[in-house]
């Protein structure tokens, strides 16, 4: 509709304000200056634009910044972020943690969208590694974030960042991921004393080798059964009955309830019956 392309007299927007919600789409296109919009992006969030109107505002920004938005605009996108495609986001260079937080806030409480996944990927690649502050932020918004990374991606996590990891952040990690994270955790916590060290390392033990489990068995750690059940089968098999007894302490009685499940089942089959009998649990090898 060519006749609608010129801004009607008196409708040119001097600023981004609530009056614009009454503009039709073509009026927004014709009467809102893209540069003005870019400088007043922080106001858009507070104005109840429809999604159709947000489409027009996005289009204006796309025309102004065909190579991708500057960070000064990205930081104030707010709900307009929901209109961005992963392709749009790949053009961005986001370096500020504050910008990342502002955009994650828009998505807060919901599963990670493709947009958010792309944003995080761009941000982490831009930083070169997953530093502690970034990891802190990401796991606060998405507790499962760490376990969504491939072992290759996890290899870029510096040991110092491991301090930001909470036990629940590892709930959905598989053994391949824990294989990568465990040595980093071991390095990060190496200067802690026995009991404190065990508290910190416990959630990473799914990646621990046999020799480390043997060492822990000498430290009266009293590992619970839930942790024991997450250990690598190949790491548990070489342990002796005496070592497992020391590792579990008072929790050793829990082996009976788990005797049909790995790694307990496989470990029992590797032991001499005489040794198993010393536990007094009725375990049959």
């Amino acid at each position: 509709e060519v006749e609608k392309t010129a801004c009607p007299s008196g409708k040119k927007a001097p600023e981004i304000d609530e009056s614009l919600i009454f503009y039709k789409k073509w009026e927004l296109e014709a009467c809102v200056d893209a540069a003005l919009l870019a400088t007043q992006m922080d106001r858009v969030n507070a104005i109840p634009f429809t999604y159709e109107q947000l489409d027009v505002l996005k289009h204006k920004l796309d025309e102004l910044y065909p190579q991708g938005y500057p960070e000064s605009v990205i930081q104030h996108l707010g709900y307009l972020f929901l209109k961005m495609s992963p392709e749009d986001i790949r053009k961005w260079n986001v370096t500020s943690l504050e910008t990342l937080k502002a955009l994650l806030e828009v998505n807060k409480g919901h599963e990670m969208s493709p947009q958010v996944a792309t944003l995080i990927d761009r941000f982490v690649k831009g930083r070169g590694q997953l530093d502690k502050d970034t990891l802190d932020t990401l796991t606060a918004f998405y507790p499962g974030y760490l376990c969504s990374l491939s072992p290759e991606e996890l290899s870029s996590v510096p040991p110092s960042s491991i301090w930001a990891v909470r036990p629940q952040d590892l709930d959905t990690c598989d053994p391949r991921q824990l294989d990568v994270l465990y040595p980093k955790a071991r390095l990060a916590f190496q200067n802690m004393n026995g009991s404190e060290y065990f508290v910190k390392i416990q959630s990473f033990l799914g990646g621990a080798p046999t020799e480390d489990l043997k060492a822990l068995s000498q430290q009266n750690v009293s590992m619970d059964l839930a942790t024991f059940m997450k250990l690598r089968t190949d790491a548990v098999l070489p342990l002796t009955v005496a070592e497992v007894q020391k590792l579990l302490g008072p929790h050793v009685e829990g082996l009976k309830a788990e005797e049909r499940h790995r790694p307990v089942r496989d470990w029992i089959l590797r032991q001499r019956q005489d040794d198993l009998d010393t536990l007094g649990l009725g375990l049959q090898g």
Epitope: P48, F49, Y79
Partner: nanobody, 119 residues
Framework: QLQLVESGGGLVQPGGSLRLSCAAS????????MGWYRQGPGNERELVAV???????SYADSVKGRFAISMDNDKHTVYLQMDSLKPEDTAVYYC?????????????WGQGTQVTVSS
Amino acid sequence: QLQLVESGGGLVQPGGSLRLSCAASGSVNSITAMGWYRQGPGNERELVAVITDRGRASYADSVKGRFAISMDNDKHTVYLQMDSLKPEDTAVYYCNAHRRTWPHPGDYWGQGTQVTVSS
């Protein structure tokens, strides 16, 4: 998803009043604004009034001083009190809600309720 159901439309004489209601159900969390639009015969759909989840209301010039929008956050319901109605207010009135988070961001619309102002 989010469902919107309008009620309260009808036939009224010029100068009379009507109160429209719109009840939201389903994914009512994250509604950031609700509003009323109308579409008269042969016209485009136009915004009449909108209210944000923080209670800020805005009105089209043509209804200022005559219409009042309000929201009951607990009941997830928005109302439009229409006084001093004129024949030019005749239209189908549509309720609208903005939901501004994943997994279903977007504008949600009701089916519309007919308002006819005629003597």
